[in-house]
Interface confidence: low
């Protein structure tokens, strides 16, 4: 069974900051391991050093800890268009990102895919492309926004939402023609 969140934190709070309570002897506070290292052996007694070892290649710890193992380095997901911004080091996980003129779309909390920023053809840029958000486009007259691209109103079918956006244009054109014939 997974312990309740906070159990370890409650135990650690008995000791001063930067130390943790010895798992076999609750009268001993051991110094936590620095980032980039992990706990190999608990300190044998008060005032004695904790045996910390450096993380092996392909693993890391990003903060002081008393973990028995380092964490595995994340891998950038090529099939999601991700590129490596910085490699994994013993004290920092791999940093993945997107190429220039791309943005991140998050599928879930820790997973993103890179997509090209919209160029707003047949429209204007309302908000520039951000790291985690596509360009927001405003379409020119006679065009409507579909999946963040400006599409000609000639492609607007009655059943689609675009009728609200395209209808005024159609009515305007007809109105202009009518006034010219009277």
């Amino acid at each position: 069974l997974v312990p309740h969140l906070g159990d370890r934190e409650k135990r650690d709070s008995v000791c001063p900051q930067g130390k943790y309570i010895h798992p076999q002897n609750n009268s001993i506070c051991c110094t936590k391991c620095h980032k980039g290292t992990y706990l190999y052996n608990d300190c044998p007694g008060p005032g004695q050093d904790t045996d910390c070892r450096e993380c092996e290649s392909g693993s890391f710890t990003a903060s002081e800890n008393h973990l028995r193992h380092c964490l595995s380095c994340s891998k950038c997901r090529k099939e999601m268009g991700q590129v490596e911004i910085s490699s994994c080091t013993v004290d920092r996980d791999t940093v993945c990102g997107c190429r220039k003129n791309q943005y991140r779309h998050y599928w879930s909390e820790n997973l993103f895919q890179c997509f090209n920023c919209s160029l707003c053809l047949n429209g204007t840029v309302h908000l520039s492309c951000q790291e985690k958000q596509n360009t927001v486009c405003t379409c020119h007259a006679g065009f409507f926004l579909r999946e963040n691209e400006c599409v000609s109103c000639s492609n607007c079918k009655k059943s689609l939402e675009c009728t609200k956006l395209c209808l005024p244009q159609i009515e305007n054109v007809k109105g202009t023609e009518d006034s010219g014939t009277t």
Epitope: S74, H105, W107, S108, E109, N110, L111
Partner: nanobody, 119 residues
Framework: EVQLLESGGGLVQPGGSLRLSCAAS????????MGWVRQAPGKGLEWVSQ????????YYADSVKGRFTISRDNSKNTLYLQMNSLRAEDTAVYYC????????????WGQGTLVTVSS
């Protein structure tokens, strides 16, 4: 307990269609991106398709693009894969999976459903 139950597999002729379903339970379906993965006989796993938790984004492997459509019904906790223009190379066991995307591509798998494309 997380459960994923696939159905809809079977024998179909080349060019035919099938619709796979995956009934999910034991977790908050709406919160997770879901996907389909397949394993052809004697081959490794191949990632097929994925859909965002809200259903607004879909992603496909090049091998199935334009032929397969992934969808989900969050009110029914069900994931679907509509497979059209099936080819012999689509023959595989298809697995439904939850995509959390942290340490492994898929943390939870179904038992799979066999799709055989043959004349």
């Amino acid at each position: 307990e997380v459960q994923l139950l696939e159905s809809g597999g079977g024998l179909v002729q080349p060019g035919g269609s099938l619709r796979l379903s995956c009934a999910a339970s034991g977790f908050t379906f709406l919160k997770f991106s879901m996907g389909w993965v397949r394993q052809a006989p004697g081959k490794g796993l191949e990632w097929v398709s994925q859909i965002a938790n809200t259903g607004d984004r879909r992603y496909y492997a090049d091998s199935v693009k334009g032929r397969f459509t992934i969808s989900r019904d969050n009110s029914k906790n069900t994931l679907y894969l509509q497979m059209n223009s099936l080819r012999a190379e689509d023959t595989a066991v298809y697995y439904c999976a939850i995509y959390t995307g942290r340490w492994a591509p898929f943390e939870y798998w179904g038992q799979g459903t066999l799709v055989t494309v043959s004349s």
